[in-house]
């Protein structure tokens, strides 16, 4: 389906302000894709922890079509997209949808298939060249050899499209060989390897900070020369800077 033309006055539900839920709030230009391993290497209860991690990360992002766009995909031998980058919904509704992702518990979770899906479906057309593109690959299993023949090709394809791939290996069955291959493709492709889902909570803030640091800030709005520029102090807006690149909103 093609997007309907948008008039400058159109107000979408996602533009209706929702207050930030945490002190750290990433206000950057970012297209972020969450890929969730739906294999039985994670128990159903562990998969619930994985979803909690995704929802908690979403709470720390300024989600909108202007700032951080998100996609959420559960992968097994195929891929099931729950949220697309262009979905115009309020952040709270997107978090609710992410919380409802169903546990597949399949024998296989194919990283090759989901990276292919990311390359050819999610990032088929780059409609926001000014934004960073990041894929967070949450992996707890190893796909069979026969399925991984084109794995490197897809990772390279994503690199050509300037898509950063951040693998998060979880537990003893995560495919470390594939994680190392992803890391080798680009310096930004930093991996996080955790011994179990229990470590996701303590790694969450580091991961979200790393992602945020990879994304550009929005350029300041350009004003006609004869127009006075009004600036508002950070105290009034409640915005302060945590570091060189990311914004923090103090509640």
């Amino acid at each position: 389906p093609t997007d309907a033309p948008v008039s400058p006055t159109t107000l979408y539900v996602e533009d209706i302000s929702e207050p930030p839920l945490h002190d750290f709030y990433c206000s950057r230009l970012l297209d972020l894709v969450f890929l969730l391993d739906g294999s039985s290497r994670l128990s159903e209860a562990e998969f619930e922890v994985l979803k909690a991690f995704v929802v908690d990360m979403m709470e720390r992002l300024r989600i909108s079509q202007k700032w951080v766009r998100v996609a959420v995909v559960e992968y097994h031998d195929g891929s099931h997209a729950y949220i697309g980058l262009k979905d115009r919904k309020r952040p709270s509704e997107l978090r609710r949808i992410a919380s409802q992702v169903k546990y597949a518990g399949s024998q296989v979770a194919s990283t090759s298939e989901v990276l292919k899906y990311t390359l050819f479906q999610i990032f088929s057309k780059i409609d926001r060249p000014e934004a960073s593109r990041i894929t967070l690959l949450l992996m707890a299993s190893q796909e069979p050899q026969r399925m991984s023949r084109n794995f490197v090709r897809y990772v390279q394809g994503l690199k050509k499209k300037k898509v950063i791939v951040i693998p998060v290996g979880i537990g003893p069955h995560a495919n470390l060989k594939q994680i190392r291959l992803i890391e080798k493709q680009a310096p930004e492709n930093k991996a996080f390897v955790l011994s179990s889902v229990d470590e996701l909570e303590q790694q969450r803030d580091e991961i979200v900070s790393y992602l945020c640091d990879l994304a550009p800030e929005a350029p300041p709005p350009t004003l006609p020369p004869d127009m006075a520029q009004v600036t508002v102090g950070p105290g009034l807006l409640g915005v302060s800077t945590l570091g060189p690149k990311r914004n923090s909103m103090v509640l």
Partner: nanobody, 126 residues
Framework: AVQLVDSGGGLVQAGGSLRLSCTAS?????????LGWFRQAPGKEREFVGG????????DYAEFAKGRFTISRDHAANTVYLEMNSLKPEDTAVYYC??????????????????WGQGTQVTVSS
């Protein structure tokens, strides 16, 4: 801190049904917790009955509860329910609701739970 209030217990005949409720004091934190039901019969250890995930998508049951007991949650009402059917005299116990942080995956481990209800007595007569 989350306060949990258990209710709905009572005396019921074998083969009958009961619905227990567990209501939390705070809605904001309620949705962040996996909720478990435990029971303790006189002179026995407290045991896991079943649990429902923070999202409401996943449930887990002890073997004795499968097919007879159902756990559900109503986020709007801050409440978790334990629907018990085909009750047997051996189901007689004090039933407790407990809350577990959503980053914990071992729902059956009693020591993992952060908050507990006061318990509600269920008596099944033959």
């Amino acid at each position: 801190a989350v306060q949990l209030v258990d209710s709905g217990g009572g005396l019921v005949q074998a083969g009958g049904s009961l619905r227990l409720s567990c209501t939390a004091s705070e809605r904001t934190t309620f949705s962040s917790y996996t909720l478990g039901w435990f029971r303790q019969a006189p002179g026995k250890e407290r045991e896991f009955v079943g649990g429902i995930s923070w999202s409401g998508v996943s449930t887990d049951y002890a073997e004795f509860a499968k097919g007879r007991f159902t756990i559900s949650r109503d986020h709007a009402a801050n409440t978790v329910y334990l629907e018990m059917n085909s009750l047997k005299p051996e189901d007689t116990a004090v039933y407790y609701c407990a809350a577990l942080g959503r980053y914990r995956s071992n729902w059956r481990n009693i020591g993992q739970y952060d908050y507990w209800g006061q318990g509600t007595q269920v008596t099944v007569s033959s």
